[in-house]
């Protein structure tokens, strides 16, 4: 026994998360995401910006490219060449919108040590990428795609047309960037690189969104953007391939858009080369609950490609919008004609099906009350998949392997039992055929990543266990989570609670309601997170809880697709419903419940606050959007169909914020957003502002100049101490 | 095709000194990488060090300060200096070459190999 007095002072060593250490980043972790290179070789940058080549059978390192070499460019990222001859060395960095960004690029010649001279690349480049075999050089400056057979050639120019805000070769535009794709490029290389496909979108009849930023000149500058809000003119788009061989041959050539997509306002969702010759196209009505699959050949004769009808593939809809929150793509079996996707099964959830001809004739592979989210890889004998089938929590994470090679395909749970406490939310990255992969994982305990042998699962090694972050929380008091789920009206209400460390039951908490709550969103997962909500219960001794009520996703299409055509009801009603719950647990204090919510959080967030229920004193909206006119066309309508007569508009206008301005009379609402917020228009907040003041109701308010839709940088500890001392005060709390 | 003949191994004590040479047949030697290679006893055969056709070069880890990799394109042969010599670095060494870039570690990657020669340092 030790005396009581040694037990007290080993207590007060412990001591509660801050602010500081939050703003900090602190308790941050690190994950490990091998550079795979081949089946057995992956590279990766070390602590002192080495580029190193790891041998996994051997065991060995290798040096390909030393921290002098990156740095006499300043390279922040680097690419490797598939023929190991070159390595291109990106700097200069400039973030534009959420994936895009441009840069400088060297190309380092590997053979002699030195930096590719003559031909060098222009800049700043938009994109730019090697080719799968060999080293040949895809780029798009000035929103055209140029070709390099090597990377001292002179460049081959394949598109003309590219203009600012006009017309965009090889990239998106931002609707396509932020709500399609998503991603930062729109061309894909051929398996060998034998053809490179593109996109050209056309934003010519595009409204513009203007903002002014404001910078340090003497007049601010304006942000010109085509962004298609709801029910505005959208991109058109078009999609080519060239043969990189001989580029100037027979030039760019058309994939035809099928005629039952081509009939109306249409998108192109994605792009899978299946062979050299064969290629997968997606495409998605305008009105987004109907999808089609194009295969598509290589026609030798005529140097064109053959769209035939009898390889369409048509995916609808009738409860809601087609897919999850995009829509899944393909992946092709060894066959090169079938392929895995994952669409719903009869009873509404999402599994993995495997098509050989159509998809009436479609074989389930996984099937349950629950859902298949993602498929990493098929082998000749393997399919890799996540779910979170495990112990029926939805929050959760495991990887799966099916024997495909075998009849009856046999499953084993791959990660359910690895580290059972410390890790229920993985992802994997998997080497060529197979051979190895990588396991990360996100929680709810310290991450951890490792590597694995891809034929009997065996662990390798451990690539990286945050142990400085393990050692660092040993004298922290963390506050407890727990993950939970109330039954009402047959709907299943999962939450997150977060507790105080000293949390006693038989005491009286204030509560905070962390919401985001988006179509096909989860906030209830188990995962490891030190952040503002964590300091507030272990410093300020508050209870968070987070809530996935109707809309959210992977718990099937009846509680998703709840909130089709409807936005801005179900999601705040249940937030409501829970609270109630919460309060009936008998340890909140219902003079003392907040709420607050950021982006689609903010806009659920202002709606509770405004729901006329009594039930919360105060709330924070993070760049909210308040009305859906306002915002993205692709996102808005996929749930929301169309702001006119005979579709959708009287709910897009019963759905807004201004619509209940009278009723925050009775609450504190702060409200916050980013001038310069390209994604959720500075707009929005300036409706709800006007709206308010036009009511003569009394708020607060805080706008962060030349912010966008992230409020980074020094925004970001302005943000979290601002809104620290508002709930403090809202909750009677001392600073 | 390219045939490869190493020489220069035997026994050595630890912290001794060996060089490794590697004797091509063919008129192209320039234009190929160049590798050695070293296999112990129950082990995969691993890269050791490798030079491109330019000059450039690729160490182990284990190996890096210690071993120093050369060619001389005139005599089409390849070298393999290994200094501070350690019992771990017992093996057969095998000499390597390929058409394109050096900077492939796995055994696979090497098209043509020489017959290998066994240094061992004993401690």
């Known amino acids: 026994l030790r005396p009581s007095r040694v037990h007290n002072s080993e207590e007060n060593t412990m001591r509660a998360l801050t602010l500081k250490d939050i703003l900090n980043g602190t308790f941050s972790y690190k994950t490990f995401f091998p550079n795979w290179i081949s089946g057995q070789e992956y590279l990766h940058q070390s602590a002192d910006n080495n580029i190193v080549l790891y041998n996994i059978e051997t065991g060995q390192s290798y040096t390909i490219l030393s921290n002098r070499t990156m740095k006499s460019v300043n390279a922040s990222n680097y690419g490797l060449s598939p023929d190991r001859q070159f390595v291109y060395l990106e700097s200069d960095y400039s973030k534009l919108w959420r994936y895009s960004y441009t840069a400088t690029y060297y190309i380092y010649d590997l053979s002699n040590g030195e930096f590719v001279r003559g031909n060098e690349l222009p800049r700043p480049i938009q994109y730019l990428c090697w080719s799968p075999v060999g080293s040949k050089l895809a780029y798009v400056y000035q929103n055209n795609i140029y070709l390099k057979q090597r990377p001292g050639d002179p460049p081959f120019q394949i598109t003309f047309n590219g203009r600012e805000n006009k017309i965009f070769n090889g990239i998106p535009d931002w609707v396509y960037e932020e709500e399609m794709l998503p991603t930062k490029y729109a061309l894909w290389w051929s398996p060998n690189g034998k053809f490179l496909a593109y996109a050209e979108f056309n934003d010519k009849d595009i409204p513009v969104i203007a903002y002014s930023y404001y910078g340090d000149e003497q007049y601010p500058r304006t942000i010109n953007i085509p962004y298609p809000k709801a029910g505005a003119k959208n991109p058109v788009v078009r999609i080519f391939i060239i043969d990189t061989t001989y580029p100037a041959y027979v030039g760019p050539q058309e994939v035809p858009v099928p005629a039952m997509i081509a009939s109306s306002d249409y998108y192109f969702s994605w792009l899978t080369w299946v062979t050299d010759e064969r290629v997968c196209l997606q495409w998605l009505k305008r009105v987004q609950n109907v999808s089609v699959l194009s295969i598509c050949d290589f026609r030798e004769d005529w140097q064109t490609w053959d769209c035939p009808k009898t390889q369409e593939h048509i995916e609808e809809s009738r409860t809601g919008w087609a897919g999850g929150f995009f829509v899944s793509r393909p992946v092709f079996s060894y066959d090169a004609i079938s392929y895995y996707k994952i669409f719903s099964d009869k009873d509404g959830y999402k599994h993995i099906h495997y098509i050989k001809d159509t998809v009436e004739n479609a074989i389930q592979i996984t099937s349950g009350k629950w859902e298949a989210i993602n498929i990493f890889r098929v082998t000749q004998d393997s399919l890799f998949y996540s779910s979170n089938e495990f112990e029926e929590y939805p929050g959760r994470r495991n990887i799966y392997r099916i024997s495909i090679g075998s009849y009856p395909p046999s499953k084993k749970c791959v990660t359910c039992h690895l580290r059972k406490e410390r890790c229920q939310y993985y992802t994997a990255s998997f080497s060529d055929y197979a051979k190895y992969y990588a396991l990360v994982c996100y929680g709810p305990g310290i991450p951890i990543s490792t590597l694995h042998d891809g034929r009997t699962d065996q662990e390798i090694k451990i690539l990286e266990e945050n142990k400085e972050l393990e050692n660092a929380l040993k004298n922290i008091q963390l506050p407890k989570e727990e993950i939970k789920k109330l039954e009402v009206d047959e709907i299943t209400l999962w939450y997150k609670m977060i507790l105080p460390p000293q949390f006693d039951r038989s005491k009286k908490y204030p509560l905070l309601i962390q919401v985001y709550g988006g179509p096909c969103s989860q906030s209830v997962r188990s995962v490891f997170a030190v952040n503002w909500i964590s300091y507030l219960a272990s410093k300020e001794g508050m209870v968070i809880a987070l809530v996935d009520g109707r809309g959210t996703a992977f718990q099937g299409d009846k509680l998703l697709y709840a909130v089709y055509r409807k936005l801005g009801v179900y999601e705040v009603e249940d937030q409501i419903t829970a609270v109630r719950k919460f309060i009936e647990m008998g340890f909140i204090d219902e003079k003392r419940i907040a709420i607050w919510g950021w982006s689609y959080g903010g806009y659920v967030s202002s709606l509770a606050l405004a729901s006329g229920t009594g039930l919360f004193k105060c709330g924070i909206a993070v760049a909210p959007v308040s009305s859906w006119e306002y915002y993205a066309s692709v996102y808005t309508e996929r749930f929301m169909g169309l702001p006119t007569k005979d579709d959708n508009l009287e709910h897009y206008k019963n759905s807004t914020v201004m619509a209940r301005a009278e009723y925050f009379r009775n609450v504190d609402y702060l409200l916050i957003h980013g001038t310069a917020d390209d994604n959720v228009h500075f707009q929005n907040s300036a409706q709800i502002a006007k709206a308010l003041v036009n009511a003569q109701v009394d708020f607060q308010a805080m706008w962060y100049s030349d912010q966008n839709h992230g409020l980074s940088g020094l925004s970001t500890n302005h943000l979290y101490t601002h809104m620290t001392h508002f709930l403090k005060q809202c909750f009677s709390l001392s600073d | 095709q390219v045939q490869l003949q190493e020489s220069g191994g035997g026994l050595v004590e630890a912290e001794g000194s060996l060089r490794l040479s590697c004797a091509a047949s063919g008129r192209t030697f320039g234009s190929y990488a160049m590798g050695w290679f070293r296999q112990a006893p129950g082990k995969e055969r691993e890269l050791v060090a490798a030079?491109?056709?330019?000059?450039?070069?690729l160490y182990a880890g284990s190996v890096k300060g210690r071993f120093t990799i050369s060619k001389d394109n005139a005599k089409n042969t390849v070298y393999l200096q290994m200094n501070s010599l350690k019992p771990e670095d017992t093996a057969v060494y095998y000499c390597?070459?390929?058409?394109?870039?050096?900077?492939?570690?796995?055994?696979?990657?090497?098209?043509?190999w020489g017959q290998g020669t066994q240094v061992t340092v004993s401690s």
């Open positions: 390597a070459a390929r058409s394109g870039g050096a900077y492939y570690t796995a055994r696979v990657d090497w098209p043509y």
């Open positions: 030079i491109s056709s330019g000059g450039s070069t």
